[in-house]
Amino acid sequence: ASTQSPSVFPLTRCCKNIPSNATSVTLGCLATGYFPEPVMVTWDTGSLNGTTMTLPATTLTLSGHYATISLLTVSGAWAKQMFTCRVAHTPSSTDWVDNKTFSVCSRDFTPPTVKILQSSCDGGGHFPPTIQLLCLVSGYTPGTINITWLEDGQVMDVDLSTASTTQEGELASTQSELTLSQKHWLSDRTYTCQVTYQGHTFEDSTKKCADSNPRGVSAYLSRPSPFDLFIRKSPTITCLVVDLAPSKGTVNLTWSRASGKPVNHSTRKEEKQRNGTLTVTSTLPVGTRDWIEGETYQCRVTHPHLPRALMRSTTKTSGPRAAPEVYAFATPEWPGSRDKRTLACLIQNFMPEDISVQWLHNEVQLPDARHSTTQPRKTKGSGFFVFSRLEVTRAEWEQKDEFICRAVHEAASPSQTVQRAVSVNPGLAGGSAQSQRAPDRVLCHSGQQQGLPRAAGGSVPHPRCHCGAGRADWPGPPELDVCVEEAEGEAPWTWTGLC
């Protein structure tokens, strides 16, 4: 075994167990866990006479190290006297000594509770120049107490702290206040209030909480839309900062590129929200080729009242690519709304999730405000899907009963677009190269959270309608139920209601 210095422990009796008329009393010192032998134990008894006896060392079975006890018996006025047991272990080092000073007996005591409290921010929600940490040492039996402040385990300058003690009935409380600079506090150091009492150590520690985004301010950086990137060929990215408190001092949004190359001129917009916060957006035009080749763009947000800058970066999504499948459907006529129809477009199994959806009528792109498209959601597989919904009027379909749903996506070939045509009245439609016969089955979202019936006639499906596999060449994502209409007559299918 290698050389090991001893751990030293005082051995005392409980004061209440010593008779008040006792003329002598014995106390001890345990030195344990040392190797090799020997240890030398001496006692300082002050002015009192005492006899000492050191017991032979015993071997600790598991470690092979040694332990020994030295006993001191004193007589006379021992009650208030302090005694020092001095243990030397020369094999550890010639000057290795451990002193333990203690009284003859240990009183029952209530240990302190140690808790650190932190001063609050100033009125504006900012850190003041100095931060106060208050160490509350409460509820202990009155007695000598020692408070030390540590910074990352190192004893701090006493000049930083002040302490005061109060007694409440049988118990005492002490508080020590540490004044830290904002600099210290923000340096992510750990501060510990260490209390020594009755030979025991009690402590509590604290540090600045990690700030994800300062005081609820959030920044978002968008990628260019596939439409802007591949169709308009003028991609932009937008840095959006929300939940800013309107205040003096400018919010600065600064753009940079990871390559260090210069950035284009950005445009900025500020909007006061109804809840009193400020939203700032900065839009930066980026080069189509730069983006496609994987350039990284950074937006840095600074403000005098932000404790630190917010950084956001964006680049082309990495990972596997998959082109979207596009399916377009028309809803049947609904009682009471003969002059309106809803068209639906399911776009699925694409990767990555960036996609633009457009609707066209008469070869003209309809305004985005006309249709509503969901955010991309993951399929049960590895791809994504979206639904797009368009309301059309009788005037439109009577003018030309063909509407096109187009998806713009980087994996679509040859021109980053996939499109499908849909007619309100498929039997009457003239059709086109891109139009497609309505499927043998209707796809509808399985979620019935709207409480819609499964069929037009109520909660019971139409007798000729059943849920089934439908056509194998019309795959639907697992999120969709399938309702198959057993066709009669010439119409290949009819829609009797919602699944």
């Epitope: 900012h126 850190f127 000049d159 600079s181």
Partner: antibody
Framework: SLGESRGRLVTPGGSLTLTCTAS????????MGWVRQAPGKGLEYIGW?????TTYYASWVNSRFTISRTSTTVDLEMTSLTTEDTATYFC????????????WGPGTLVTVSL | ALVMTQTPASVSAAVGGTVTINCQAS??????LSWYQQKPGQPPKLLIY???TLASGVPSRFKGSGSGTQFTLTISDLECDDAATYYC????????????FGGGTEVVVK
């Protein structure tokens, strides 16, 4: 001691990075600050970086300047420079435990001019 | 924002005399204040930190005092070599500050 890389003449709108290196002590153990002084003017605080790399800046900096560190250097990256940025730039070590700068570099002159 | 105001901007005294420079913080900074001496063409030199602690190698003629918001640097037994510009600096805050230094005081020794 501390030393800053040589300053130089920069045209308005240009960029420059100053590097601070140490000899005789390990830079990585200390918080560091950058301070500048325009000709004939007083000292002006630019920013501060903790030993762990957390940075804070004077409110006038407005993200034009960035302080960063490696295990052996502390850099001050300056962008969109204007003639008002003409000054001697100092790096300084915070070495007292009370936030004071006990060791300063000799300073390097940066001139922004057409 | 925390602002440091230093007065006077300039002070003149004879060799052997005493000068007093004041520094006021707009918010309490406890004792987180240091004083620097700067001579033309040189970097600043730390004189006093923690409001009143003398930096290594600084003569005891330099004395710092104060805490909270009011601080003073006193230079007694003035020597010709003391002619310089003196700056106070708050060492507490790093957020929302325009300058951590006072405006400086030029000391002229006659």
């Amino acid at each position: 001691s501390l030393g800053e890389s040589r300053g130089r003449l920069v045209t308005p709108g240009g960029s420059l990075t100053l590097t601070c290196t140490a000899s005789g002590f390990s830079l990585s153990s200390y918080a560091m600050g950058w301070v500048r002084q325009a000709p004939g003017k007083g000292l002006e605080y630019i920013g501060w970086i903790s030993a762990g790399g957390t940075t804070y800046y004077a409110s006038w900096v407005n993200s034009r300047f960035t302080i960063s560190r490696t295990s052996t250097t502390v850099d001050l990256e300056m962008t969109s420079l204007t003639t008002e940025d003409t000054a001697t730039y100092f790096c300084a070590r915070e070495g007292t435990g009370w936030g004071a700068y006990d060791i300063w570099g000799p300073g390097t002159l940066v001139t922004v001019s057409l | 924002a925390l602002v440091m105001t230093q007065t006077p901007a300039s002070v003149s005294a004879a060799v052997g005399g005493t000068v007093t420079i004041n520094c006021q913080a707009s918010q309490s900074i406890h004792k987180y204040l240091s004083w620097y001496q700067q001579k033309p063409g040189q970097p600043p030199k730390l004189l006093i930190y923690r409001a009143s602690t003398l930096a290594s190698g600084v003569p005891s003629r330099f004395k710092g005092s104060g805490s909270g918001t009011q601080f003073t640097l006193t230079i007694s037994d003035l020597e010709c070599d003391d002619a310089a510009t003196y700056y106070c600096q708050q060492d507490a805050a790093v957020i929302s500050i325009d300058n951590s230094f006072g405006g400086g005081t030029e000391v002229v020794v006659k």
